[in-house]
């Protein structure tokens, strides 16, 4: 079998939901010593970066200015050390937002409910779309989808304090082109007294964990790595 390097990690810096005409930044984290990184879009080569010096950098950033629906879709990356290529990274879905109109989000029976009550969100957008998306701020990876001509409903079932937080919805023209976000609706759930004080407050958009953790190797890191390698050999 053909030998390959471990697959890199692909991430969107700040958020994978990029307003149209704004810049998206994707990070590909591979390996120290990689001489070339390639970003692929829908299976075709999109961009190339050659880090300098390669032995000091474990990844690169790919900049996608002027975001639009032609650049929205599935991205992946690979890297090369010498003549050896890595496996392909997982796919990352990059979405363009602020297309067309703004939906309206409402909640029934209201924004203040008691734990155990059934709650339904309604997202309405009068322009032609059939798919609607509901996102909880700080949890934008957990997208709920629903379908309808001009309105979609999102039944939440009996809620707990874990459902507390701010919600927004989008109309979707395809999987990767979304409307402007609705105004946020803050859901307040009372009850579960013992859990209330422990319920964490969600970070607001963008998700705080969507960051590029690329590092430059310093001389000290290199010395420590060499020392560790020597120590391992001595132990053997």
């Amino acid at each position: 079998p053909k030998q390959t390097l471990p697959k890199p990690i692909i991430r969107a810096e700040s958020t994978y939901m990029v307003p149209k005409e704004k810049q998206a930044t994707l990070c590909c984290q591979g390996s120290y010593g990689a001489v070339e990184y390639q970003l692929h879009f829908e299976g075709s080569l999109f961009a190339v970066e050659r880090p300098k010096p390669p032995e000091r950098i474990n990844g690169v950033k790919f900049h996608i200015p002027d975001m639009n629906s032609r650049k929205a879709g599935r991205y992946s990356c690979i890297y090369r050390v010498g003549e050896l290529w890595s496996e392909r990274s997982d796919l990352l879905d990059l979405v363009v937002t602020e297309m067309y109109d703004t939906p309206t989000l409402s909640v029934h029976p209201g924004p203040e409910v008691t734990s155990g009550e059934k709650v339904t969100f309604y997202c309405r957008l009068d322009t032609a779309t059939s798919m609607f998306l509901l996102l909880k701020e700080g949890r934008s990876r957990d997208v709920q989808r629903s379908y309808g001509k001009v309105q979609a409903e999102f039944p939440m079932g009996p809620v707990t304090t874990a459902h507390r937080g701010s919600y927004r919805c989008f109309g979707s023209y395809n999987n990767y082109a979304w409307s402007f976000p609705s105004e946020p609706v803050k859901l307040l759930v009372t009850g579960d007294i013992e859990n209330t004080s422990l319920a964490p407050t969600d970070p607001t958009f963008p998700d705080s964990w969507d960051t590029c953790l690329l590092t430059r190797e310093t001389g000290l890191q290199k010395d420590l790595a060499l020392w560790d390698h020597t120590a391992q050999n001595l132990l053997r």
Epitope: F41, A47, E49, K52, H63, P65, D66, R70, K71
Partner: nanobody, 127 residues
Framework: EVQLVESGGGEVQPGGSLRLSCAAS????????MGWFRQAPGKEREFVAA????????YYADSVKGRFTISRDNAKNTVYLQMSSLRAEDTAVYYC????????????????????WGQGTLVTVKP
């Protein structure tokens, strides 16, 4: 707003050479990654060569590797495509394109990445 104007096209015999130029207006040239694409009659537009913003890293389509050279002169706001050992299959309209603004040394290969395009210059290779 960036405007790109190509020049240098013309008719040449197989094995001959041509140098295309692309002059960019505006002060954003230094922050632009640049590329050349071509479109032959009845075919889709295809990538030819690209160059990064600052250090001048380059990338070429396999079909032109070793024959074409892309370069840039930031002082003159111009990108060049030196074409040698030309073949009949190189006949096409050649387009200059820019990605503005960009950072780092990304080299862009996909046409969707480019947000500014020139009008094109025709290159004809025939005996």
């Amino acid at each position: 707003e960036v405007q790109l104007v190509e020049s240098g096209g013309g008719e040449v015999q197989p094995g001959g050479s041509l140098r295309l130029s692309c002059a960019a207006s505006g002060r954003t040239f230094a922050s632009a990654a640049m590329g050349w694409f071509r479109q032959a009659p009845g075919k889709e537009r295809e990538f030819v060569a690209a160059i990064s913003r600052s250090v001048g890293d380059t990338y070429y389509a396999d079909s032109v590797k070793g024959r074409f050279t892309i370069s840039r002169d930031n002082a003159k706001n111009t990108v060049y495509l030196q074409m040698s050992s030309l073949r009949a299959e190189d006949t096409a309209v050649y387009y200059c394109a820019a990605v503005v603004p960009t950072y780092g040394n990304n080299i862009y290969v996909h046409s969707a990445a480019y947000n500014y395009w020139g009008q094109g210059t025709l290159v004809t290779v025939k005996p």
